[in-house]
Interface confidence: low
């Protein structure tokens, strides 16, 4: 009896797992085995597909085959008993295009009021997503085990800290991976649950802020108790986006090791241009707090947010204010690549009534002034970036007298 070739072959690819499924054509024939060949683009010859030879079931795994995932391949299958069926050819496909993203692996660490999530990207050590790992983002769903109220958090980092949780409370979470440009996403990972620890005697430092003074960065934070020592660590922000870098190291800022105040000062040249993460930890000699929430610190924005420098041209009924780049020491202007908004406050010298102008331009007219009157002006800069919402301190006030009448031309 002639064997019929199998039909309806399906190729399932999840990360680097390649699975083939098919239907038997002739259920009545026992002891039938199935074998696959494959063919790469531009090749005439067919090659036996290892892992899929003489298979008795209707499923096989060819993950061990080291394929170029960007290269189109073709498969064919036949049934074998004493004789063989004709080959059935499967539509050619490109593994990378066909592949689905598998759920990420998740490892949890508990703090008293936070959970640290370590995410291993899909296809951890495989070829399929080897070049795509920096492009993944993650959706984290978290809920108290005793409640069904789920909170969703989006992250581009491989290590994410979820703060503002309750001590000694069990939280559950699941994570899915998303690749926006490929328009693919995984299913959610299995649910992981963890109980936060008993409340630490020492809370973490809060409200960390960085400012610039002269050639130094000044890092300040708030803390509940006195007589503490603090340490500050930094990390390149991009290292937390780099999945190959689970072993990234937070580094100490030497000038901020074991400081006894709630601030530390370190030279601006400690950091090259770039975006960094900073965190602070408190200790009383016996106990140590958990690390504070990490703050994002952009050296460029930080440098730009020195207060603006401005000149005033006085007319009888208005001031023309020309805003320039702030000066560093050595009188060199700071180059500004970021769009800024300027807030200008002015008032009559003899009055406390302040008026405000918000302006994107660097030349600003302050209208409706009285002639021969002394007005004072101060200004500050704000970034227009919502994610890095920063403001400079106000400049020193500059006071000028308006001209006599009829000099507005």
């Amino acid at each position: 009896k002639n064997l019929k070739s199998p039909q309806k072959v399906e190729v399932d690819i999840i990360d680097d797992n390649f699975i083939l499924r098919w239907n038997r054509s002739d259920e009545s024939v026992g002891n039938v085995t199935f074998s696959f060949d494959y063919q790469k683009t531009g090749m005439d010859n067919w090659i036996k597909l290892s892992g899929c030879q003489n298979i008795t079931s209707t499923k096989c795994n060819f993950s061990s085959l080291k394929l170029n995932v960007y290269e189109e391949i073709k498969l064919r299958i036949r049934a074998e008993k004493e004789n063989t069926s004709s080959w059935y050819e499967v539509d050619s496909f490109t593994p990378f295009r066909k592949a689905q993203i598998g759920p990420p692996e998740v490892h949890l660490e508990a703090e008293d009021k936070a959970i640290v999530i370590h995410i291993s990207p899909p296809g951890q050590d495989g070829n399929m997503w080897a070049l795509e790992k920096p492009s993944f983002s993650y959706t984290i769903r978290i809920w108290q085990k005793s409640s069904s109220d789920k909170k969703t958090i989006n992250s581009t980092y491989y290590v994410e800290k979820i703060p503002e949780l309750l001590p000694e409370t069990t939280y559950c979470l699941e994570v899915k991976a998303i690749h926006p440009s490929l328009k693919k996403h995984s299913n959610y990972s299995p649910v992981h649950c963890i109980k936060t620890t008993v409340e630490n005697e020492l809370p973490p430092p809060e409200n960390i802020e960085v400012s610039v003074q002269n050639q130094n960065y000044v890092l300040k934070w708030d803390y509940t108790y006195a007589n503490m020592t603090f340490q500050v660590q930094w990390l390149h922000a991009f290292l937390k986006r780099n999945p190959g870098n689970h072993l990234y190291k937070w580094k100490q800022i030497p000038d901020c090791e074991n400081v006894k105040t709630t601030q530390c000062v370190f030279p601006q040249n400690v950091f090259q241009k770039g975006i960094y993460l900073l965190r602070v930890q408190a200790s009383d000699g016996n106990n140590t707090s958990f690390w504070s929430e990490e703050i994002k610190f952009d050296t460029e924005i930080q440098a730009f947010l020195l207060p603006p420098v401005f000149n005033i041209r006085s007319l009888s009924d208005s001031f023309h204010i020309y805003i320039g780049a702030p000066k560093q020491s050595g009188n060199t202007p700071v180059i500004q690549d970021y769009p800024l908004i300027y807030e200008i406050i002015f008032w009559e010298n003899t009055s406390n009534a302040e008026r405000k102008i918000i302006e994107k331009k660097t030349d600003v007219t302050v209208p409706n002034l009285k002639p021969l009157t002394v007005y004072c002006v101060k200004a500050r800069a704000h970034t227009m970036d919502e994610k890095l919402n920063k403001s400079s301190v106000f400049s020193d006030a500059v006071c000028e007298k308006t001209k006599p009448g009829n000099t507005s031309k």
Epitope: H236, G244, K249, K251, I253, P254, F271, Q272, K273
Partner: antibody, heavy 123, light 107 residues
């Protein structure tokens, strides 16, 4: 002044390993990454990897992961590279070079180089 | 890995010439680019880091420029001692990678 001292030459038999040294002076050894770079005869430069002498954290070029092992001895300010199972393909000059600072210049350039050790693999 | 492509493998030049060597990265490297000079039998010497910063002791006739993926090393007036091979290298992303080198020869 900053110096990285390397022995001039090593003659090795095929299949044998070799351990090359790089002695640092003139700076705080544990404050800068230490890189290793290969240059085969008449060819360009290839980065092998780097080690943080303060805690022996290593970043390898995957191409050399099975070939090279980086270590340091902090007490003598010396970095080492061990090359295993040598073949003629491993005949090259191996340079050590100081990299960016561990704290201040994390991804800095390789500013000081040793003179290189010429490894010849021959029976 | 990030590929670094140097435009020419060799240049035949005259003393006093102005010379430009270009280097293109396969992805953005945020100015983490170094230029090295290597003479036969010697170790590479760092000329420029951060794409534009001239190292101490390097003559001012050397300069670096560029951003994102495209970078340039310029020598304003070529001297005899500048005859060497020049390499660019990115140190933005591990593994650090070098260009294939540009060799200068005197006409």
């Amino acid at each position: 002044q900053v110096q990285l001292q390397q022995p001039g030459t090593e003659l090795v038999k095929p299949g044998s390993p070799v351990k090359l040294s790089c002695k640092a002076s003139g700076y705080t050894f544990t404050s800068f990454w230490l890189n290793w770079v290969q240059q085969r005869p008449g060819r360009g430069l290839e980065w092998i990897g780097k080690i943080d002498p303060s805690d022996s954290e290593i970043r390898y070029n995957q191409k050399f992961k099975d070939k090279a092992t980086l270590t340091v001895d902090k007490s003598s300010n010396t970095a080492y590279i061990q090359l295993s199972s040598l073949t003629s393909e491993d005949s090259a000059v191996y340079y050590c070079a100081r990299g960016g600072g561990i704290y201040y210049d994390y991804d800095g350039a390789m500013d000081y180089w040793g003179q290189g050790t010429s490894v010849t693999v021959s029976s | 890995d990030i590929q670094m492509t140097q435009s020419s493998s060799s240049f035949s030049v005259s003393l006093g010439d102005r010379l430009t060597i270009t280097c293109k990265a396969s992805e953005v490297i945020y100015n983490r680019l170094a230029w090295f000079q290597q003479k036969p039998g010697n170790a590479p010497r760092l000329l420029i880091s951060g794409a534009t910063s001239l190292e101490t002791g390097v003559p001012s006739r050397f300069s670096g420029s560029g951003s994102r993926k495209d970078y340039t090393l310029s020598i304003s007036s070529l001297q005899t001692e500048d005859v060497a091979t020049y390499y660019c290298q990115q140190y933005w992303s591990s593994p650090f990678t070098f260009g294939s080198g540009t060799k200068l020869e005197i006409k």
